[in-house]
Amino acid sequence: LQDLCSNCPAGTFCDNNRSQICSPCPPNSFSSAGGQRTCDICRQCKGVFKTRKECSSTSNAECDCISGYHCLGAECSMCEQDCKQGQELTKKGCKDCCFGTFNDQKRGICRPWTNCSLDGKSVLVNGTKERDVVCGPSPADLSPGASSATPPAPAREPGHSPQ
């Protein structure tokens, strides 16, 4: 009997109620492999999810996130709110990065500017909420009489104070 079931292709299930005949998956269900005893319920993309690929008898639906949200999880199993560059998501919504930190994406968190002095370099371009600092040559590499256009980066990593 097991051998009969193994003959059932993807898109069908082995129906015990019908002498193990291969029956098509019912609407809104699928089987992606052969020999299945049941079909799986199709994923529904609703709420903050939108459909990227419709469910078929042999493959599950695939979801994306609606505008203003981004996917998390191996198969976009979650949607998280976007923020602007220079912000991060907190309990109080999207908040600007604290001084000394930046976020160049619509997702993720604010992280400290690179500390140029740790590599013996100077700050060539100051950091902003949206961009990291750009490190330049070390002060010793500068020609005599020349000086860095901007002060060196803070010696310690900046912390986050509650807003």
């Epitope: 991060e88 907190t90 604290c98 930190t101 400290p112 509650p162 807003q163």
Partner: antibody, heavy 117, light 109 residues
């Protein structure tokens, strides 16, 4: 579907360096995610070790910072952990994970590393 | 000591409700994430953000928070919910991660 797989040489002797690699499949390591290492000693809780971005930028757990190096190889779609001067206290299951805004949304199955002479 | 504090263990009768708490200064500003871990398996994310469940996580799992305390509630606990549960958030720096010590949930009956 993104999947992570840890691999390493197995047992490590005290004072030696532990080396592990995490292979990323079903997606690019150059996506806008960070890639973390987390460990769990037998019968104990989870401990975050550190993380890396595809640019090579890293952050480490301060308690391990002096011994940890995390690197990334975008051409092989993998990232690696090195932990130096290991002791028996470093015996643990080591997990790699994908991190997004503090959410570890995809995990490897973990690999047990035993430190023993 | 961990920057996120959890009770080590809690038990609940089958079908009843259990609440797990997680305390830490960073939780005043940022939400905790919650992970379920069964023996010999990798952790699985069950709650993130204010009270969001990944697809596939049953709606008996929910989260709430107040001040510096985050809570995970299992309403109508099932035998398969027996596991260790870890909260996670940022450490004091704001850009590194930390886990709570974990809470072992035992489902009785």
């Amino acid at each position: 579907q993104v999947q992570l797989q840890e691999s390493g040489p197995g047992p490590v002797k005290p004072s030696e360096t532990l080396s592990l690699t995490c292979a990323v499949s079903g997606g690019s390591i150059s996506s806008s995610h960070w890639w973390s290492w987390v460990r769990q000693p037998p019968g104990k809780g989870l401990e975050w070790i550190g993380e890396i971005y595809h640019s090579g930028r890293t952050y480490y757990n301060p308690s391990l910072k002096s011994r940890v190096t995390i690197s990334v190889d975008t051409s092989r779609n993998q990232f690696s952990l090195k932990l130096s001067s290991v002791t028996a206290a470093d015996t643990a299951v080591y997990y790699c994970a994908r991190e997004d805004g503090g959410i570890m949304d995809v995990w490897g199955q973990g690999t047990l590393v035993t430190v023993s002479s | 000591s961990s920057e996120l504090t959890q009770d080590p263990a809690v038990s609940v009768a089958l079908g009843q409700t259990v609440r797990i708490t997680c305390q830490g200064d960073s939780l005043r500003r940022f939400y905790a994430s919650w992970y379920q871990q069964k023996p010999g398996q990798a952790p699985v994310l069950v709650i993130y953000g204010k009270n969001n469940r990944p697809s596939g996580i049953p709606d008996r799992f929910s989260a709430s928070d107040s001040g510096n305390t985050a809570s995970l509630t299992i309403t109508g606990a099932q035998a398969e919910d027996e596991a260790d549960y870890y909260c996670s958030s940022r450490d004091r720096s704001g850009y590194r991660w930390v886990f709570g010590g974990g809470t072992k949930v035992t489902v009785l009956g």
